[in-house]
């Protein structure tokens, strides 16, 4: 039961996290005009990964997409890439984890396969979360650098060109959404990996095993390390965790082809 709960919770947390990463990537408010200690304007500027917007006090909002690829800063391109990689990995992870869920039975899929899938999806969620956190952090660092540069030089002018008040940008809502979403995806991934550890030993956690060796019978309940007799498929020493109290997961035990030798 604990394994199922951990796996299910990990899936849900990751799902929320990935939804958040998608939302953050699509949001326009990655950077917003800094209003502190600035002349108060009737126009509010904010920028996203894909377009920049201007909202007038009347409520009129105009957004313009970045229709160039080569003209964009390399850092912005890197952030875009990180967020997209995060989304793709997260989406694949979600797909894999659906089939890995213990509560969903697909054909005669063994627990070992589900354990592997759980681990795979968990790793994917961890990498996805890290990508999102990295992307948002890179953008935040870029903002901080630009903020202090524009603070040092509030007014810029080039040659005979018009002097323009440099608009300073600060952290937008999307950054916080991205950080939280990345963190949730990461946590969900870790939970999936933990759930995998609980799933993996179950294939060898037998209720009763009968060994016929050297003419005499040895029947025992597993506990501690299982003796390696060279029979069956269990040739490796595996620690069987048996706390005495049985969970619901352990109640239903179907005989496998290796149960009897």
């Amino acid at each position: 039961m604990a394994v199922t709960a951990c796996q299910g919770l990990g899936f849900v947390v990751s799902l929320i996290g990935i939804a958040g990463i998608i939302a953050a990537t699509c949001m326009d408010q990655w950077s917003t005009q800094d209003l502190y200690n600035n002349p108060v304007t009737a126009v509010f500027n904010y920028q996203g990964l894909w377009r920049s917007c201007v909202r007038e006090s009347s409520g009129f909002t105009e957004c313009r997409g970045y229709f160039t690829l080569l003209g964009l800063p390399a850092m912005l391109q890197a952030v875009r890439a990180l967020m997209i990689v995060g989304i793709v990995l997260g989406a694949i992870g979600l797909l894999v984890s659906i089939f890995a869920l213990k509560c969903i039975r697909i054909g005669s899929m063994e627990d070992s396969a589900k354990a592997n899938m759980t681990l795979t999806s968990g790793i994917m969620f961890i990498v996805s979360g890290l990508c999102a956190i990295a992307g948002v952090s890179v953008f935040a660092n870029m903002l901080v650098t630009n903020f202090w540069m524009s603070t040092a030089n509030m007014y810029t002018g080039m040659g005979g060109m018009v002097q323009t008040v440099q608009t300073r940008y600060t952290f937008g809502a999307a950054l916080f959404v991205g950080w939280v979403a990345g963190g949730l995806t990461l946590i969900g991934g870790v939970m999936m990996c933990i759930a995998c550890r609980g799933l993996a030993p179950e294939e060898t956690n037998y209720k009763a095993v009968s060994y016929h060796a050297s003419g005499h019978s040895v029947a025992y309940k597993p506990g501690g390390f299982k003796a390696s007799t060279g029979f069956g498929s269990n040739t490796k020493n595996k620690k069987i965790y048996d706390g005495g109290a049985r969970t619901e997961d352990e109640v239903q035990s179907y005989p496998s082809k290796h149960d009897y030798v």
Partner: antibody
Framework: QVQLVESGGGVVQPGRSLRLSCAAS????????VHWVRQAPGKGLEWVAV???????NYNSALMSRFTISRDNSKNTLYLQMNSLRAEDTAVYYC????????????WGQGTMVTVSS | DIVMTQSPLSLPVTPGEPASISCKSS????????????LTWYLQKPGQSPQLLIY???TGESGVPDRFSGSGSGTDFTLKISRVEAEDVGVYYC?????????FGGGTKVEIK
């Protein structure tokens, strides 16, 4: 059609208060911002204050301490509360609707005259 | 506060001839986000309320004759009347529509010679 009608003007003694009203029709005050602009006799236009559709307000810094802009959404009416009036506040007071684009003022009322005199 | 300076104070014109009014702001009215200049032009005809002519420095308000055109960027702006008509007389005002408080220029009185 869009119409703005100012009222409440008149002769008032220095130091006294006065409340101007601006009845709007043809649009909602919760959709468009409305400004107050004044014009002293024979002088140019002077921006007084604005209340935006969302309810936020901005003032002429020189008048902020004495003037308050407000509105009654149910009556679709705008108000300008003027306290501690001075002789230099004598002017025609216009209310004007904020254009949806460019922060301009696209519709103006006919104005109401306020005379501050002892 | 932003200071708006208009010139000339008075502009006598001949009907059918072009006219030009200048407006300078103490700070740029150009918004870097959308590359638009938040400068507005108004005309106040004698005995009337002002009317909006141009916003965003160069975009004509609907219903305004196309003989009126606005140009300029940053701090220097110009209103041009390609062919002045008798009905164009009045006082022209430019307005800062970017920084609070919004401020108007002193006005330019256009009159027929």
């Amino acid at each position: 059609q869009v119409q703005l009608v100012e009222s409440g003007g008149g002769v008032v003694q220095p130091g006294r208060s006065l409340r101007l009203s601006c009845a709007a029709s043809g649009f909602s005050l919760t959709t468009y911002g409305v400004h107050w602009v004044r014009q002293a006799p024979g002088k140019g236009l002077e921006w007084v204050a604005v209340i935006w559709a969302g309810g936020s307000t901005n003032y002429n810094s020189a008048l902020m301490s004495r003037f308050t802009i407000s509105r009654d959404n149910s009556k679709n009416t705008l108000y300008l509360q003027m306290n501690s009036l001075r002789a230099e506040d004598t002017a025609v007071y216009y209310c004007a609707r904020a254009a949806y684009y460019g922060n301009g003022l696209d519709y103006w009322g006919q104005g109401t005259m306020v005379t501050v005199s002892s | 506060d932003i200071v708006m300076t208009q010139s000339p104070l008075s502009l006598p014109v001949t009907p059918g001839e072009p006219a030009s009014i200048s407006c300078k702001s103490s700070q740029t009215l150009l918004n870097s986000g959308n590359q638009k200049n938040y400068l507005t032009w108004y005309l106040q005809k004698p005995g009337q309320s002002p009317q909006l002519l141009i916003y965003w420095a160069s975009t004509g308000e609907s219903g305004v004759p196309d003989r009126f055109s606005g140009s300029g960027s940053g701090t220097d702006f110009t209103l041009k009347i390609s062919r002045v008509e008798a009905e164009d007389v009045g006082v022209y005002y430019c307005q800062n529509a970017y920084f609070y408080p919004f401020t108007f220029g002193g006005g330019t009185k256009v009159e027929i010679k």
